[in-house]
């Protein structure tokens, strides 16, 4: 008799979900010297210890102490690049400004870059059917905690000036909800962190707008005040050109005329 | 926010020189184009030189081969040498990426320092 099984309203488990983990593990740890100590097979190990027989709603930060040990990785704390809502645009960034690092250049934020994940309690089955939606079902989810678990040590980890790429096509271009504006924001430790400076990326062609005195922005700038660091914003009217002169900053339309 | 702090500015009779620093944190200022620009009193704020990343150098006709810009990245100063000063040169100078501000803002200025160049 086929068991009863929990309908969430979320997506299941990604396929082949184990085989894409130990994957991009071992890509990883090929690319990165410094990661080649770690044991893929321990990894994944920790990773299905997190979630697997237990409750996908009754998920805790504990749980992923044993894969946060394994995964535990130096980043330079002065080169560290949060984004809320502008995923690609700061991963395009990284990969031409090595030396900067998002969340997702990070072992651990590599594994679980796009992936969905949960099981069920008492069985050892991943759950490919459906799992936990944050807003319908439970915030205590496998995938949720997980987000929350590395970037809260993300941010604890940045010093100097920190750097955060901000959406200034949505409507709140500070969003208080987003896991910048609830985790990464209220991690940042200021006996380390001297600025946080935003880049808001502009999305019209035609958009001169001074959006970093957008209403959002001013209550991001207030929030981090209060925790004594200094705010900075810039304007990205031109993301495709600013990408552009990254690239190749030596290039005549990259530098002001005199 | 306070990303760029100028200094080395002062009086100085013509002739003489004078040595700019600035320091710029933030990843802006390392990976583009920095500049030094100019205020006189009463006048628009004015280019005067340019650096790139890669050390490519541009001056304003007025202070060619009498300025000189650099930059240190290992320790985030962009510097201006300003020899065979004349009281043209008198201004409030800053520096600032120089990026064209259609792609990225120069919103964020900082106080400037002073440079006085008597007769």
């Known amino acids: 008799v086929p068991r009863w099984r929990q309908q969430w309203s979320g997506p299941g488990t990604t396929k082949r979900f184990p085989e894409t983990v130990l994957a991009r593990c071992v890509k990883y740890t090929e690319i990165h010297p410094e990661m080649r100590h770690v044991d893929c097979q321990s990894v994944w190990d920790a990773f299905k210890g997190a979630f697997i027989s237990k409750h996908p709603c009754n998920i805790t930060e504990e749980d992923y102490q044993p894969l946060m040990k394994l995964g535990t990785q130096t980043v330079p704390c002065n080169k560290i690049l949060l984004w809320s809502r502008i995923k690609d645009l700061a991963h395009q960034f990284t990969q031409v400004q090595r030396d900067m690092f998002t969340l997702e250049d990070t072992l651990l934020g590599y594994l679980a870059d796009d992936l969905t994940w949960c099981g069920e309690f008492n069985t050892s089955k991943i759950n490919y059917q459906s799992c936990p939606d944050w807003r319908k079902d439970c915030s205590n989810n496998p995938v949720s905690v997980f987000w929350k678990t590395v970037s809260r040590r993300f941010a604890e980890a940045a010093c100097d000036v920190v750097h955060v790429m901000l959406n200034g096509s949505r409507s709140k271009i500070f969003d208080k909800n987003s896991t910048f504006g609830s985790v990464e924001v209220h991690n940042l430790q200021p006996e380390k962190v001297q600025t946080l400076e935003a880049w808001v990326i502009h999305g019209g062609r035609e958009d001169s707008r001074d959006l970093c005195q957008d209403p959002t922005i001013k209550e991001l700038e207030s929030i981090i005040s209060k925790r004594n660091i200094q705010f900075s914003c810039k304007n990205i009217y031109r993301p495709d050109k600013f990408l552009q002169c990254v690239k190749n900053p030596e290039d005549s339309s990259c530098t002001s005329e005199i | 926010q306070v990303q760029l702090v100028e200094s080395g500015g002062g009086l100085v009779q013509a002739g003489g020189s004078l040595r700019l620093s600035c320091v710029a944190s933030g990843i802006i200022f390392r990976i583009f184009s920095m500049g030094w620009y100019r205020q006189a009193p009463g006048k628009q704020r004015e280019l005067v030189a340019t650096?790139?990343?890669?050390?490519?150098?541009n001056y304003a006709h007025s202070v060619k081969g009498r300025f000189t810009i650099s930059r240190d990245d290992a320790k985030n100063t962009v510097n201006l040498q300003m020899n065979s000063l004349k009281p043209e040169d008198t201004a409030v100078y800053y520096c600032n990426v120089a990026i064209p501000s259609g792609i990225v803002d120069r919103s964020a200025w900082g106080q400037g320092t002073q440079v006085t160049v008597s007769s």
């Open positions: 650096i790139t990343s890669g050390g490519n150098t």
